[in-house]
């Protein structure tokens, strides 16, 4: 649902020699870049699994859905999609799995209709803070982006340039307040250990937030209060041990929310009492009957909904496996 899809019809492949012949000139209306498939009817261009090392220069002006997946792009420079005339209709851009390790400031400038962007499965060691905002102004022009898919963009540990990966991604999300209109944000499978305080409050239009399969150990300062439109919150497969009263109250106060909490190592001691009480009453947690204790050992696999206050005593000695994510 979050990637550009095609109502594919009548794809035409170009002859490879065409692209180099006209790359410096405005593209012809029906031209298709080398190694790509194009459907003007579907307004779709697919350059998939072609080992491209750069974005084709001669993309047709009609393109609305552009797939550049499974390539070897390495670097996305400023103005990577800037064309004359501009790609004014490009609404959905999928760059997943294209071995991108650097996205520079202004990489997506001059795409006035870009609503969906998928950068998943790229080892982004260097994501510029201004990748999405385009400029380093404290308040930049609003981005048209509505969906931003950044699943599994964490690079291998030895390529992380000795800085916080969470911080790098968050900086790009917040720069210039450009993404105030963002409705879907997917950040699954990125080894996130934390979210900076109040970061979500700066993305007030969010409807869908996917933080699943990370290593989040606490939500103590993750405020959901301002996210009044939030409909789904995916927190499965993290390292959460307990949710505290403040978080529970904020989630309960969101009018449309569905929360997914499966596969977290819940610690069933006295600190869990409020969460258990809340789970028994709330309708917002999907599959709440599947939530089970991981620690202490005597409570392992007990269903949270079946616990009572007498079951929840302190203080467990936590095993080393719970001490690091």
């Amino acid at each position: 649902s979050s990637s550009p899809t095609s109502s594919a019809s009548s794809f035409s492949s170009s002859a490879p020699f065409l692209a180099s012949a006209v790359s410096a000139q405005p593209p012809l209306p029906d031209q298709c870049p080398a190694l790509c498939e194009c459907s003007e009817a579907a307004r779709t261009v697919k350059c998939v699994n072609r080992n491209l090392t750069e974005v084709p220069t001669d993309l047709p002006a009609y393109v609305r859905n552009l797939f550049l997946t499974g390539n070897q792009l390495a670097v996305l420079p400023a103005g990577a999609f800037a064309r004359r005339p501009p790609l004014a209709e490009l609404a959905a851009l999928n760059l997943s799995g294209s071995r991108l390790d650097e996205v520079r400031a202004g990489a997506f400038e001059h795409l006035p209709s870009l609503r969906q962007l998928d950068l998943s499965h790229n080892p982004l060691a260097d994501l510029s803070p201004f990748a999405f905002s385009g400029s380093n102004a404290s308040v930049s022009a609003p981005s048209p982006l509505v969906e931003l898919i950044l699943n599994h963009i964490v690079p291998p540990e030895d390529e992380r340039q000795n800085r916080s990966f969470e911080g790098m991604v968050v900086a790009a999300l917040l720069a210039g307040r450009a993404l105030q209109g963002l409705r879907r944000l997917e950040l699954a499978s990125n080894h996130f250990l934390y979210l900076p305080r109040d970061v979500l409050a700066q993305l007030p239009s969010l409807r869908h937030l996917d933080l699943s399969n990370n290593s989040l150990v606490s939500l103590t300062y993750v405020s959901f209060r301002n996210l009044t439109h939030l409909e789904s919150l995916h927190l499965e497969d993290n390292a959460l041990k307990v949710l505290h009263n403040g978080t529970l109250a904020e989630l309960q106060g969101l009018p449309h929310i569905r929360v997914f909490l499966d596969n977290n190592p819940w610690v069933c001691d006295c600190h869990m009492a409020d969460m258990v009480t809340w789970l028994k009453e709330t309708e917002v947690v999907q599959g709440k009957d599947r939530l089970t204790c991981a620690y202490p050992e005597k409570m392992r696999n007990r269903v949270l909904l079946e616990l009572n206050s007498a079951d929840l005593d302190c203080d467990p000695i936590l095993p080393p496996s719970l001490q690091t994510s």
Partner: antibody, heavy 118, light 107 residues
Framework: QVQLQQSGPELVKPGASVKISCKAS????????VNWVKQSHGKSLEWIGD????????NYNQKFKGKATLTVDMSSSTAYMELRSLTSEDSAVYYC???????????WGQGTSVTVSS | SIVLTQTPKFLLVSAGDRVPITCKAS??????VAWYQQKPGQSPKLLIY???NPYTGVPDRFTGSGYGTDFTFTITTVQAEDLAVYFC?????????FGGGTKLEMK
């Protein structure tokens, strides 16, 4: 790289005020809280308060309410702390620090020494 | 406010020693504890957050554990450059508070 550059040492008289600056660079200033911490000579650390540069919202340690005022200038990516009605008890090194993981401070300024003496 | 009691105040160590430092909170702070190192004349440096997670670039000889009220910071094999003061901090509730510090000195 991330840097927090604090203003220089201050020698002030009792009863006076002082305003310390902390210029941030190398990261998105509005994305992270700035915390302020006091360290008296040879002592532990005391959290004064924090400020959200995105909206100027502040949290203070009750002990420093009325003593410290935290502000930011987004256009210059600079945080400020003003200390007023100074006494010898306020003589200390004051640090600004960028917050990373919530509440935890991952980058610190070099510290500003404030000496209150007549 | 939450009081953090750090022990010991001083530690005499030899290179290669395993060094544990404890921090006890006056009430539960879940896993919301950080540990810092401060060398003479320098600013503090973040080592561990959320009780057990090493900050980016921190050598793996520095480890943390604990939950609730009792926390331990360990240097598994002390090196000469580890001589410093170490502080715990709770970030569970405002005001954030620090322990009194533990000074590591060489025998």
């Amino acid at each position: 790289q991330v840097q927090l550059q604090q203003s220089g040492p201050e020698l002030v008289k009792p009863g006076a005020s002082v305003k310390i600056s902390c210029k941030a660079s190398g990261y998105t200033f509005t994305a992270y809280y700035v915390n302020w911490v006091k360290q008296s000579h040879g002592k532990s650390l005391e959290w004064i308060g924090d400020i959200n540069p995105n909206n100027g919202g502040t949290n203070y340690n009750q002990k420093f309410k009325g003593k410290a005022t935290l502000t930011v200038d987004m256009s210059s990516s600079t945080a400020y702390m003003e200390l007023r009605s100074l006494t010898s008890e306020d003589s200390a090194v004051y640090y600004c620090a960028k917050e990373g993981p919530p509440g935890a401070m991952d980058y610190w300024g070099q510290g500003t020494s404030v000496t209150v003496s007549s | 406010s939450i009081v953090l009691t750090q022990t010991p105040k001083f530690l005499l160590v030899s290179a290669g020693d395993r060094v544990p430092i404890t921090c006890k909170a006056s009430q539960s702070v879940s896993n919301n504890v950080a540990w810092y190192q401060q060398k003479p004349g320098q600013s503090p440096k973040l080592l561990i957050y959320y009780a057990s997670n090493p900050y980016t670039g921190v050598p793996d000889r520095f480890t943390g554990s604990g939950y609730g009220t009792d926390f331990t910071f360990t240097i598994t094999t002390v090196q000469a450059e580890d001589l410093a003061v170490y502080f715990c901090q709770q970030v569970y509730s405002s005001p954030f508070t620090f322990g009194g510090g533990t000074k590591l000195e060489m025998k």
